[in-house]
Amino acid sequence: EVEKTACPSGKKAREIDESLIFYKKWELEACVDAALLATQMDRVNAIPFTYEQLDVLKHKLDELYPQGYPESVIQHLGYLFLKMSPEDIRKWNVTSLETLKALLEVNKGHEMSPQVATLIDRFVKGRGQLDKDTLDTLTAFYPGYLCSLSPEELSSVPPSSIWAVRPQDLDTCDPRQLDVLYPKARLAFQNMNGSEYFVKIQSFLGGAPTEDLKALSQQNVSMDLATFMKLRTDAVLPLTVAEVQKLLGPHVEGLKAEERHRPVRDWILRQRQDDLDTLGLGLQGGIPNGYLVLDLSMQEALS
């Protein structure tokens, strides 16, 4: 086949418009000026270029900006963003939240791609911390975003950003992540009154220590069983039957259905059977009456 390198007569693009969708790839390569493309990037997303054609346009931008695209171009990439590799994105310096939003919009409703993950990483590192506006944006597009971060990364989240977190954003967080987030949430919500505080802190309680659970038990919070089941086992074990009863309020009856599951199972094993009997739920497996419980961990700590 003859090499088709010259732009055919009359086909030189004077602007980026829909007539270009009927160009073959070689015609786009030969007839579209890279500088024109860069100045009219905002038009590209409104035109239904095929992904093969977008590859050609990307190639033109790569030649024009070998060190990485300027933000003025990045903001208008639209579907062309889907053709970028993580290596391309690592060359960018994205500082505007508007640019981030524009690019996340392209992938909306789909799981986080390696490109998106790289983009977010670049953006957050550039900002130095995960501020509230950024977190708001990221969790709006990717509810599981927060739980994809390591405990080390989460440590850079300022307490003020916690206000942006919705309960569903924490659904896939593990205890190590909640251990980091809980103290931040406690600090963020510290000036709220009892019932309002509990509503806000509830999703973070998987990171709460025993003393905070004891304090909550004095506030008539009526914790539901789903929340109780997500508490740290080591935080639940020292709670007394009376404290758990106060913590759960009317939901205490749900313990029966969960008696074989952690942390309820382990907690039952630590309680005196006659204390469990006071609940009237038929919970079995507690320490029989007359037995003495030695806390060996305490003994080791003293020796």
């Epitope: 239904p48 095929t50 093969e52 579907y79 889907l82 392209v106 409703g109 789909h110």
Partner: nanobody, 116 residues
Framework: QVQLVESGGGLVQAGGSLTLSCAAS????????MRWYRQAPGTERDLVAV??????YYADAVKGRFTISRDNAKNTLYLQMNNLKPEDTAVYYC???????????WGQGTQVTVSS
């Protein structure tokens, strides 16, 4: 994944009409644009028409004669072809591309023959 199956091709007299259909299945929610291409023997595959959101685009050779449309409820793309000419003879292909995966999908093609 998106699967595309064309139908409606056939033999027709010059000046006649045909309607091609393309049934889409699979991850149709992620479809970004849908297109009709055609390929005559010994030539490159040419873009005929595109539907993108509510906008439609046509190649100069078919403007005013062909109409592309999409029924989202039925996940079907159509190409209504009127006043057909012998030069419209080709295999017609349905194409769709998707967001997220940034992939192109093609149907197997349907033959349209216009006799003079």
């Amino acid at each position: 994944q998106v699967q595309l199956v064309e139908s409606g091709g056939g033999l027709v007299q010059a000046g006649g009409s045909l309607t091609l259909s393309c049934a889409a299945s699979g991850s149709t929610f992620s479809i970004r644009a849908m297109r009709w291409y055609r390929q005559a023997p010994g030539t490159e595959r040419d873009l005929v028409a595109v539907i993108y959101g509510s906008s439609t685009y046509y190649a100069d050779a078919v403007k005013g004669r062909f109409t592309i449309s999409r029924d989202n409820a039925k996940n079907t793309l159509y190409l209504q072809m009127n006043n057909l000419k012998p030069e419209d003879t080709a295999v017609y292909y349905c194409n769709a591309d998707t967001i997220g995966t940034a992939r192109d999908y093609w149907g197997q093609g349907t033959q349209v023959t216009v006799s003079s």
